[in-house]
């Protein structure tokens, strides 16, 4: 799942059904959001580049009580290799940097489109 | 809600080129691409490109290539498709549909715009 | 390319009867199938993603099955509204690709 080296080949690669489902979770999440998401709840920003998995389940795990994201903390746990807890950081975490968990979210969904239109799209 | 409207139907001449627009609204227009699809008289659906409005990125069928081009304008929701070199047998109704990746279905599709080429 | 073979081309049914619909694609595709119907002078309609996910709005007497190179469309119980042109569509790969089309027409 880490690799994502295909999308250079000459037809798009279309994700795995995990995969699949944690973008349409996060659509749903992005798409049906009425009040502020998780009460407005700050997370460190991330990088988004190899290890983003297992850096926005650090960044999201520290949110607790919010049962919109409950979910697409489940799936990503599912593609992070070790266990993630609260507190927990890599040096993937831009440290100085908070953003609302509504646009972490909607971060991610963009950057997980944008690789699945790599090598399709010119 | 949702919806694509396109524009009104063409007449053209072979060798024309013909520039067909698809209206988006009820929804944030960067976050679907935007598919074209023709439909020939009595013929079945065939697939022209797509278009992702946030870059602008395009993924056209080989079949077209060098004859299409499919732009957005962002500021007003609106893609366009155009096709140069028109020949006969490009008598269509073009059809433009969202998708959200490539790999979804097409959830929302446009009236249809009928082009007819003749001379 | 992906190539999509569906049959029978026309479907001769009454209201009432179980129409099978069937696509058939040139390499595998795992779930990335979708179905599409059709009436004269419209738009195509989605009614079924990913093979066999129902779409709100679409009636339950809709329903898709398979994988990989084989795919069923099924429609339980005809219903007048029903008799339109049913098409399989690849989401697998580019350039996507469109089956040739089923016409389920009254018998």
């Known amino acids: 799942l880490t690799c994502l080296g295909g999308f250079a080949s000459p037809g798009p690669v279309p994700p795995s059904t995990a995969l699949r489902e944690l973008i349409e979770e996060l659509v749903n999440i992005t798409q049906n959001q009425k009040a502020p998401l998780c009460n407005g709840s700050m997370v460190w920003s991330i990088n988004l580049t190899a290890g983003m998995y297992c850096a926005a389940l650090e960044s999201l795990i520290n949110v607790s009580g919010c049962s919109a994201i409950e979910k697409t903390q489940r799936m990503l746990s599912g593609f992070c290799p070790h266990k993630v807890s609260a507190g927990q950081f890599s040096s993937l975490h831009v440290r100085d940097t908070k953003i609302e968990v509504a646009q972490f979210v909607k971060d991610l969904l963009l950057h997980l489109k944008k690789l699945f239109r790599e090598g399709q799209f010119n | 809600q949702v919806q694509l409207v396109q524009s009104g139907a063409e007449v053209k001449k072979p060798g024309a080129s013909v520039k067909v627009s698809c209206k988006a609204s009820?929804?944030?227009?960067?976050?679907?691409?935007i598919h074209w699809v023709r439909q020939a008289p009595g013929q079945g659906l065939e697939w022209m490109g797509a278009i992702d409005p946030e870059t602008g990125g395009t993924a056209y069928n080989q079949k077209f290539k060098g004859r299409v081009t499919m732009t957005t304008d962002t500021s007003t929701s609106t893609a366009y498709m155009e096709l140069r070199s028109l020949r006969s047998d490009d008598t269509a109704v073009y059809y433009c549909?969202?998708?959200?990746?490539?790999?979804?279905?097409?959830?929302?599709w446009g009236q249809g715009t009928l082009v007819t080429v003749s001379s | 390319e992906i190539v999509l073979t569906q049959s029978p081309a026309t479907l001769s049914l009454s209201p009432g009867e179980r129409a099978t619909l069937s696509c058939r694609a040139s390499q595998n595709i795992s779930d990335y199938l979708h179905w599409y119907q059709q009436k004269p002078g419209q738009a195509p309609r989605l009614l079924i993603y990913?093979?066999?996910q129902s779409i709100s709005g679409i009636p339950a007497r809709f329903s898709g099955s398979g994988s990989g190179t084989d795919f069923t469309l099924t429609i339980s119980s005809l219903e007048p509204e029903d008799f339109a042109v049913y098409y399989c569509q690849n989401g697998h790969s580019f350039p996507l690709t469109f089956g040739g089309g089923t016409k389920v027409e009254i018998k």
């Open positions: 990913y093979a066999s």
């Open positions: 549909a969202r998708i959200l990746l490539y790999y979804y279905p097409m959830d929302y």
């Open positions: 009820g929804y944030t227009f960067i976050d679907y691409e």
